[in-house]
C-alpha cells in the first residue's frame, strides 16, 4: 500500500565499529525521501536524518547514550516534495531494522601497536587504547574503559628470520614476552571479546617489526 511512487526501505543493516554506528538500507531513492527513527525497547522513538535522500543514517549519538541497551530503528519513506503525504492506512510506509545491542555487536576496530620496548631478553608490547565515541562525565571512553576485562588482546610474534608464530594474551593493553637475544621480532595484535557469540575478533593490526622506529631497544 502507500502512495503510488513510494516504496518501503529494505535490507536495513547496522554497520558499527567501536560504537561508530550507521544504519544503511536500500533502495536508492527515486522521487522519495527517508526519515529514520530509533528507540530502545522501552523508550520513545526519536527522529533522525530528516527527509534525506541518503540511504544511510549515523545513529552513533543515540546509541552511545547506553551501549548495553538494545535498539530498534525504522526507516520511513515519503514522496519527494510532498512529505505530508501518507500511505493508504493514513501513515507513511516504514520498515523496521533488526534489533541491535552495541555492546554485544559493534565490530572491534583494527587495533594498533602503540610501542614496543626491549630490555635484554624481554619485550614490552603496548596496544593503543583506542578512544570511542562513548562518553561518561563529558569525557570520551577508551575501548578498555567500555569493555573492561571482557576485552582481551592476542599478540602474535615471530622472528623476522622465520615464519613460526608464537602467541601471548593479555587482559590489559600490555604484553611482556621473552625473546632470544640478538634476534629481531615482528608483532601483530588482535582484539577479542571471548564472551561474544558474534563479532568476537577484530582484524589483525598492521605488523610492526623490531629495528623500525616505533620500538625502542635497551641493552641491559
Amino acid at each position: 500500500s502507500g502512495t503510488t511512487n513510494t516504496v518501503a526501505a529494505y535490507n536495513l543493516t547496522w554497520k558499527s565499529t567501536n560504537f561508530k554506528t550507521i544504519l544503511e538500507w536500500e533502495p536508492k531513492p527515486v522521487n522519495q525521501v527517508y526519515t529514520v527513527q530509533i528507540s530502545t525497547k522501552s523508550g520513545d522513538w526519536k527522529s533522525k536524518c530528516f527527509y534525506t535522500t541518503d540511504t544511510e543514517c549515523d545513529l552513533t549519538d543515540e546509541i552511545v547514550k547506553d551501549v548495553k541497551q538494545t535498539y530498534l530503528a525504522r526507516v520511513f519513506s515519503y514522496p519527494a516534495g510532498n512529505v505530508e503525504s501518507t500511505g493508504s492506512a493514513g501513515e507513511p510506509l516504514y520498515e523496521n531494522s533488526p534489533e541491535f545491542t552495541p555492546y554485544l555487536e559493534t565490530n572491534l576496530g583494527q587495533p594498533t601497536i602503540q610501542s614496543f620496548e626491549q630490555v635484554g631478553t624481554k619485550v614490552n608490547v603496548t596496544v593503543e587504547d583506542e578512544r570511542t565515541l562513548v562518553r561518561r562525565n563529558n569525557t570520551f571512553l577508551s575501548l578498555r574503559d567500555v569493555f573492561g576485562k571482557d576485552l582481551i588482546y592476542t599478540l602474535y610474534y615471530w622472528k623476522s628470520s622465520s615464519s613460526g608464530k608464537k602467541t601471548a594474551k593479555t587482559n590489559t593493553n600490555e604484553f611482556l614476552i621473552d625473546v632470544d637475544k640478538g634476534e629481531n621480532y615482528c608483532f601483530s595484535v588482535q582484539a577479542v571479546i571471548p564472551s561474544r557469540t558474534v563479532n568476537r575478533k577484530s582484524t589483525d593490526s598492521p605488523v610492526e617489526c623490531m629495528g623500525q622506529e616505533k620500538g625502542e631497544f635497551r641493552e641491559i
Partner: antibody, heavy 118, light 106 residues
C-alpha cells in the same frame, strides 16, 4: 544461576602439594578468564594469576610462578590450582573468581581454606 | 608492580555519616575498582572502572579519582556497611589490591 563451588578446607603437610578445585555452573565456562586470589588470615588480597579456559593460556603474578599452576578441565567446567612445596606461608584462603563487564558483576567461589601443618 | 596504599587502615563511623576511603597508587592507573568483604565471606565488587556502581550495589556508594589518587565515598553509612574495603587495579600486571580499610560502625 552462576555458581563457583570450592571445597571448604584442605589440611596438608609441609613440603607436599595440593590441588584446589573450582567447579563452575550457570554460565559458559570458556567465555571468561578465571582468576585465583589468595588471602592469608587477617590479611588482604593477593592476585595469583589467571587462565583462559578456552585454551588454557595463563598469566601469573611473578611471585607465584613455580608455586601455583593453573589448569582447567573443559569437560567438567572446572578450574584447578595446584600449589607445590607447601610451607606455613601458604596457609590461606584461596578464591576463584571471574568478572563480567557486561553485567557489571563478579562471581567468587566461597574459598578453600588451606592449612599447612605437620 | 603497582603498589596500592589505602588510608585509613581502620575507620570508625556513625550511622548516617558520610565517609571517604582513599587509595593511592605508586604509579598512574587507568581506573580503580573497589571491593567490599564482610567477615567470613568472599569479596564483592562495589565500584568498577573508578566510578561505576556494580550491579545491585546501593546508590549511597560512589567512586572517583584519576591517575594515582582514588576514593570511595559512602554518603550515609548504614550498619550493614561494616566490612573491609579494598581497592584493586587491573590496568597492569600483576594485578594488585590495596591493604584494605576496615570500617567499623560506632
Amino acid at each position: 544461576q552462576v555458581q563457583l563451588q570450592q571445597p571448604g578446607a584442605e589440611l596438608v603437610k609441609p613440603g607436599a602439594s595440593v590441588k584446589l578445585s573450582c567447579k563452575t555452573s550457570g554460565y559458559t565456562f570458556t567465555s571468561y578468564w578465571m582468576h585465583w586470589v589468595k588471602q592469608r588470615p587477617g590479611q588482604g588480597l593477593e592476585w595469583i594469576g589467571e587462565i583462559d579456559p578456552s585454551d588454557s593460556y595463563t598469566n601469573y603474578n611473578q611471585k607465584f610462578k613455580g608455586k601455583a599452576t593453573l589448569t582447567v578441565d573443559k569437560s567438567s567446567s572446572t578450574a584447578y590450582m595446584q600449589l607445590s612445596s607447601l610451607t606455613s606461608e601458604d596457609s590461606a584462603v584461596y578464591y576463584c573468581t571471574y568478572y563480567v563487564n557486561y553485567y557489571a558483576m563478579d562471581y567468587w567461589g566461597q574459598g578453600t581454606s588451606v592449612t599447612v601443618s605437620s | 608492580q603497582i603498589v596500592l596504599t589505602q588510608s585509613p587502615a581502620i575507620m570508625s563511623a556513625s550511622l548516617g555519616e558520610e565517609i571517604t576511603l582513599t587509595c593511592s597508587a605508586s604509579s598512574s592507573v587507568s581506573y580503580m575498582h573497589w571491593y567490599q568483604q564482610k567477615s567470613g565471606t568472599s569479596p564483592k565488587l562495589l565500584i568498577y572502572s573508578t566510578s561505576n556502581l556494580a550491579s545491585g550495589v546501593p546508590s549511597r556508594f560512589s567512586g572517583s579519582g584519576s591517575g594515582t589518587f582514588y576514593s570511595l565515598t559512602i554518603s550515609s553509612v548504614e550498619a550493614e556497611d561494616a566490612a573491609d574495603y579494598y581497592c584493586h587495579q587491573w590496568s597492569s600486571y600483576p594485578y594488585t589490591f590495596g591493604g584494605g580499610t576496615k570500617l567499623e560502625i560506632k
